[in-house]
């Protein structure tokens, strides 16, 4: 048993030209973190299986803003170890993969959305208990530096951590530069000592007398840097730098084979044989698979079906990319016609319709009344998206639901006498006035002050009972007619105000979630 | 070889407790969403809860028939996922099988939970 | 909740035959919709996702189609290992829900 860590010392865009300036997307500020997945490197199905020895995530990076117009930094980086503890034997060969994930932090419906930007895959060698070893890799216009090491948890010891010591409580009957071990408790070993001058940090032995080299060195004691890639000083755990035997220029300078690939020279150009599991022309096409959970948000993860590809996310609803890492901003298609607000609820796009309008994307345009009939024959009246009822004599409210005195305000003029009925009020004027309102005074010579009144109609005339019955009929009618039309528009406007009510309804539900 | 294995499961009475385990083996178990599945004796599926990442906080979500009363966790260390069961009544009498992300690809072979006085 | 209803409630083919199961859903699901396999004291399997899409592994001759609140499960040709129940179950609206099953039974 042991543990497995990885120090990220920078991140940032490499050299040359067209390097990004920033790992933001233009929607603002964004953080950083890292994914390492480790597989045993030798083994034939090494590739297939999953994080076989582990894997760990980072906490969160600081947030970053590009400053405009200032030089794109080394990014700021989460702090502390990633650390991937094992609990069988070291394999001291294996695959480490590290992911870079931004995370974008500008206003996402439903929370931050992350995106997938470098990812390094390397085979590499490593003695559990050996010094750090350090590295610098380009992924994409990226650049990554970081450093790593293995070391055994007591009581685990060893290059492969499996042997097992423990602490004596008599640690004196071993001599000086011998250390007690199990499974025997008076049995001592001495560490095995390397072969004289092998290189303590690019070194290591099992045997002694041997000095096997770590991964980019290489040489009888190690001291030989296999690349240009190894000359790159790092500000890493150990300060030391080293000196490059740089080779000459050509098609494998700096080995363009990634993920651990051999490069093979070609006339003009080169040739890369990939290790089991990786493709492409630079071996760059990552051997990561289904099994290694690499569909974020709970994507469905499907083997791909060529070679090139080693799987396909299947995304939930509300996500999208490769690895469903990004979550899918449907709002911004604009869906929702005549101003309707658009909400993303994940799963699901809805429209809050404004007053007038209805359907799945506010595009059926509604009267201002439809399905708000007012009640007791008043007639509604359409205006800036809202509705008034004008109510009939009698009735009153909101919606014509309240019954009125219509005699409450003293409707009739010169001390005459109102009577509700119920197609409105009706006043009995006094002596000397006449109009329906008792408004117009009757001169003795017997003519109104109503030069247009018909001659002879008094307020006591039997013709005018005829008169308010014949005015009666045509009011009623009048209603009916409304009352008709309105019924019609409901019945014709239901099924919209049924769906948008149910629209409404489910909003509300998946909102409260 | 993928594999979940149920265990936990067994008779108890209504009101009592239970604690069932899922454990993971042929994946990396830390990036994948876990849920759990109920299947009562001759009728359907039911979706009972799930539990996210540590990038998501460990968030979980349960069906409204068990909120209150069952509770999901995880231990990544461990690739083991829990289902906490209180207050126990005879309709959750069902074999629970743990499954795998939201289209629930993995299946593990289920751990039976008999509710009865 | 969304429902899931499926018809028939039980199938009885010979070998050979075509199986056509039936899936409808309350309300749109778009094509969020899987498919699943379930034989006496196992769990269920995955055969289809995305209404129409085949998981790894499964035989040819299984295929899904539909959309919308209609998806259909189609065997071109019974196996006698085919003989199971089958669930339909729809990802489209948290929570997930799943059909009460077509048994699909020896005739």
């Known amino acids: 048993a042991g543990v497995f860590e990885l120090q990220i010392h920078s991140f940032g865009p490499g050299p040359g030209p067209g390097a990004p300036r920033s790992p933001c997307s233009a929607r603002g500020p964004c953080r950083l973190f890292f994914r390492v997945c480790l597989k045993p490197g030798l083994s034939e199905e090494a590739a297939e299986s999953p994080c076989a020895l582990g894997a760990a995530l980072s906490a969160r990076g600081p947030v970053y803003t590009e400053q405009p117009e200032a030089p794109a930094p080394d990014l700021p980086l989460p702090n502390g170890l990633l650390q991937v503890p094992f609990r069988d034997a070291w394999p001291g060969t294996f695959s480490l993969i590290i992911e870079t994930w931004r995370e974008e932090l500008g206003d996402q419906i439903g929370g931050p959305a992350w995106s997938l930007l470098a990812r390094v895959t390397r085979r590499r060698r490593l003695a559990a208990g050996g010094p750090w070893a350090r590295d610098i890799q380009r992924a994409g216009a990226w650049e990554l530096r970081f450093s790593y090491r293995a070391r055994c948890e007591l009581p685990a010891v060893g290059t492969a951590c499996t042997r097992l010591c423990r602490p004596r409580s008599a640690p004196s009957r071993c001599g000086p530069g011998l250390r007690p071990c199990a499974p025997l408790e008076d049995e001592c070993e001495a560490p095995p000592v390397c072969r004289a001058g092998c290189s303590l940090e690019h070194g290591f032995c099992e045997q002694p007398g041997e000095c096997r080299c770590l991964e980019g060195w290489t040489g009888p004691l190690c001291m030989v840097p296999v690349s240009t890639s190894s000359c790159l000083g790092l500000r890493g755990p150990s300060s030391t730098t080293t000196g490059c035997l740089v080779p000459g220029p050509g098609p494998c300078d700096g080995n363009p084979c990634a993920n651990g690939g051999s490069c093979s020279e070609t006339p003009g150009s080169f040739e890369c044989t990939c290790p089991r599991g990786f493709y492409g022309l630079r071996c760059e096409v990552s051997g990561v698979t289904c099994a290694d959970g690499p569909c974020f948000n709970g994507g469905l993860c499907v083997g791909g079906a060529d070679p090139d590809s080693a799987y396909i996310c299947h995304c939930p609803p509300g996500f999208q990319g490769s690895n469903c890492e990004k979550r899918v901003d449907r709002c911004s298609l604009q869906p929702c016609r005549n101003g309707g607000l658009c909400l993303d609820l994940g799963h699901a796009l809805r429209c809050r319709c404004r007053a007038g309008f209805a359907g799945p994307r506010c595009e059926h345009d509604l009267d201002d009344c439809a399905g708000r009939a007012c009640a007791n024959g008043g007639t509604c009246v359409e205006g800036g998206g809202a509705h008034r009822c004008s109510c009939a004599l009698g009735f009153g409210g909101r919606n014509c639901r309240e019954r009125a005195d219509p005699c409450a305000a003293r409707p009739c003029a010169h001390g005459g006498r109102c009577y509700a009925h119920f197609s409105g009020l009706v006043c009995a004027c006094a002596p000397g006035y006449m109009g329906a309102r008792c408004e117009f005074p009757v001169h003795p010579d017997g003519v109104s002050a109503l030069p247009a009144a018909p001659p002879g109609l008094r307020p006591g005339d039997p013709q005018r009972a005829g008169v308010i019955a014949v005015i009666v009929v045509v009011v009623i009618a009048i209603v009916a007619g409304i009352v008709v039309l309105v019924i019609s528009r409901k019945k014709r406007m239901a099924k919209y105000e049924k769906a948008e009510i149910k629209e409404m309804g489910e909003m509300h539900r998946e909102l409260n979630a | 070889e993928v594999q979940l294995v149920e265990s936990g499961g067994g008779l108890v009475k209504p009101g009592g407790s239970l604690r069932l385990s899922c454990v993971a083996s042929g994946i990396t178990f830390s990036n994948f969403w876990m849920n759990w599945v109920r299947q009562a004796p001759g009728k359907g599926l039911e979706w009972v809860g799930q539990?996210?990442?540590?990038?998501?906080?460990?968030?979980?979500h349960y069906a409204e028939s068990v909120k209150g009363r069952f509770t999901i966790s995880r231990e990544d260390s461990k690739n083991t996922v829990y289902l906490q069961m209180n207050s126990l009544k005879t309709e959750d009498t069902a074999v629970y099988y743990c499954t795998t992300g939201y289209y629930f690809d993995y299946w593990g072979q289920g751990t039976t939970v008999t509710v009865s006085s | 909740n969304i429902v899931l209803t499926q018809s028939p409630a039980t199938l009885s083919l010979s070998p050979g035959e075509r199986a056509t199961l039936s899936c409808k859903a309350s309300?749109?699901?778009?094509?969020?919709v899987s498919w699943f396999q379930q034989k006496p004291g196992q769990s269920p399997r995955l055969l289809i996702y995305?209404?129409?899409n085949r998981y790894t592994g499964i035989p040819a001759r299984f295929s899904g189609s539909g959309s919308g609140t209609d998806f259909t499960l189609t065997i071109s040709s019974l196996e006698p290992e085919d003989f199971a129940v089958y669930y339909c179950?729809?990802?489209?609206?948290?929570?997930?829900?799943f059909g009460g099953g077509t048994k699909v039974e020896i005739k």
């Open positions: 995305g209404a129409s």
């Open positions: 309300e749109n699901v778009g094509t969020y």
């Open positions: 179950g729809q990802f489209y609206s948290f929570p997930s829900t």
């Open positions: 539990i996210r990442l540590k990038s998501d906080d460990y968030a979980t």
